[in-house]
């Protein structure tokens, strides 16, 4: 697995322990957490740096409506089981033996159940809408500018294929960005969109998960975009099974209708 | 340490040109701009404009459009600020200062070149 | 234009003492940037995004306010504080200065 040969760090994820023991005293590194060994060239699974994170120290409307069964992660930060590739198992249970089923990006999408919960297959997420809100800028964002400016983001930075960003919507002060891969879509050493989208949540929460670099700077025509808020939208290819108990408001989070719980991460 | 170091005073007769440089170290140059702002005698801060040396982008204050040119060298981590028809009321310290953002916040102006005094005088 | 008014122009107070400084917008701003100059040197950031302090200030220094007025207090000044203190917006182009109070010793 490549790293940056002469210190031995990973530039695409700060959670590792690297050491050059690899194949010809390569440099190798392993997540925090799991020790699962890591591409260094290209994003860290959204599962390996959940674990990894645990085990450290603690007018015309444009814009999209996201869809009956988009779900959001209410639940927050838990210990994932992940398989041996990292992704995450189709089913988590925690220490008390609470057990749920989840998507291909973690976030629960069945009732909490105990043992005997059967979780036959790990549900794709293939869209995501990631809702933000920016704060009052000197200069008005170009929403073709800006539409160029994200999609070069995640090309450059969280290393996306584009064809995976479908859509940069923007109702000032909201952007939308859709990030959409199907199954059959994704090709071997594609970077997931589950995983572009964590990276980039924890980028606009001022966590960067990329080794030595400061904080994002994200320019539009060099005038800095600063997020207020984030709301992310998950949707399955197969919709979500929940109990009319929290379809009609059981669920937590105050959300307005169905799953739409409004996660602030600011 | 970031440090921004600017060249040295200027005296500039009336209609004339000045070209103040500002010498950026200690940070990646290409992901921060670069303001101007002067001071004139017994006044306060005026804000002049500023570039972003990553892609080139500029804003300048109404009040200088068309007088105010702000280029960058990126190969030198060098700003230049070029005032051009000089006046006497242009007599000042001008000062490039660096502004840091990122996604969570704007940090402000912050270091500060040293200043450089421009006379304009006949 | 957002027209910045700083008062008073000056606060003539001892050392040790509390200094209580304004900057009033013309219009509601979301954020206001402090800044300290002594004579002969270049401006100093001190408070970023209304009440952050910037690194290396003393704590001594702390930022308020909202909408239109915004206060700079120093809870106990030092001989080092004697200075110009200028608020900045960044809500609109241009970028406006207040035009400063300055700290003396009584």
């Known amino acids: 697995h490549t790293a940056a040969q002469d210190n031995c760090t990973c530039p695409t994820n700060k959670m590792t322990v690297c050491s050059p023991d690899g194949p010809g005293g390569r440099c190798q590194c392993r997540a925090l957490g799991s020790g699962v060994a890591v591409d260094c060239s290209t994003l860290t699974s959204k599962c390996l740096l959940l674990k990894a994170r645990m085990s450290a120290p603690k007018n015309a409307r444009t814009l999209v409506r996201p869809n009956e069964h988009a779900l959001v992660d209410n639940d927050g930060l838990y210990d994932p089981d992940c398989d041996p590739e990292g992704r995450f198992k189709a089913r988590q249970c925690n220490q008390t033996s609470v057990c749920w089923c989840v998507n291909s990006v973690g976030v629960r999408r069945t009732d909490k159940g105990d043992l005997s919960l059967r979780c036959d297959e790990l549900v794709r997420t293939h869209h995501i809408l990631i809702d933000l809100r920016h704060r009052p800028t000197a200069g008005a964002f170009n929403h073709s500018d800006l539409d160029a400016e994200l999609r070069r983001l995640f090309r450059e930075r969280y290393r996306l294929h584009p064809k995976f960003v479908a859509a940069v919507h923007y109702e000032q002060p909201t952007i939308q960005i859709e990030l959409r891969q199907n199954t059959s879509q994704k090709a071997a050493g594609d970077v997931d969109i589950g995983d572009a989208a964590y990276y980039f949540e924890r980028d606009v929460k001022g966590e960067s998960l990329f080794q030595g670099r400061g904080g994002l700077d994200l320019r539009v025509r060099g005038e800095p975009l600063q997020v207020e808020r984030t709301l992310i939208y998950y949707l399955d290819e197969i919709p979500p099974k929940f109990s009319m108990k929290r379809l009609t408001g059981g669920g937590s989070g105050g959300g307005s209708h169905h799953h739409h719980h409004h996660h602030h991460h600011h | 340490q970031v440090q921004l170091v600017q060249s040295g005073a200027e005296v500039k007769k009336p209609g004339a040109s000045v070209k103040v440089s500002c010498k950026a170290s200690g940070y990646t140059f290409t992901s921060s701009d670069i303001n101007w702002v002067r001071q004139r005698p017994g006044q306060g801060l005026e804000w002049m404009g500023w570039?972003?040396?990553?892609?080139?982008?500029?804003k300048y204050n109404e009040k200088f459009k068309g007088r105010v040119t702000m280029t960058v060298d990126t190969s030198t981590s060098t700003v230049y600020m070029e005032l051009s028809s000089l006046r006497s009321e242009d007599t000042a310290v001008y000062y490039c200062a660096r502004r840091f953002a990122t996604v969570v916040s704007n940090y402000g102006l912050d270091p500060w070149g040293q200043g450089t005094l421009v006379t304009v005088s006949s | 234009e957002i027209v910045l008014t700083q008062s008073p122009a000056t606060l003539s107070l001892s050392p040790g003492e509390r200094a209580t400084l304004s900057c009033s917008a013309s219009?509601?701003?979301?954020?206001i940037y402090w800044y300290q100059r002594k004579p002969g040197q270049a401006p100093r950031l001190l408070i970023y995004?209304?009440?952050n302090l910037a690194s290396g200030i003393p704590a001594r220094f702390s930022g308020s306010g909202s909408g239109t007025d915004f206060t700079l207090t120093i809870s106990s000044l030092e001989p080092e504080d004697f200075a110009v203190y200028y608020c900045q917006q960044w809500n609109s182009y241009p970028l406006t200065f207040g035009q400063g109070t300055k700290v003396e010793i009584k």
């Open positions: 219009s509601s701003v979301n954020y």
């Open positions: 995004d209304t009440s």
């Open positions: 570039i972003y040396p990553r892609d080139g982008s500029k």
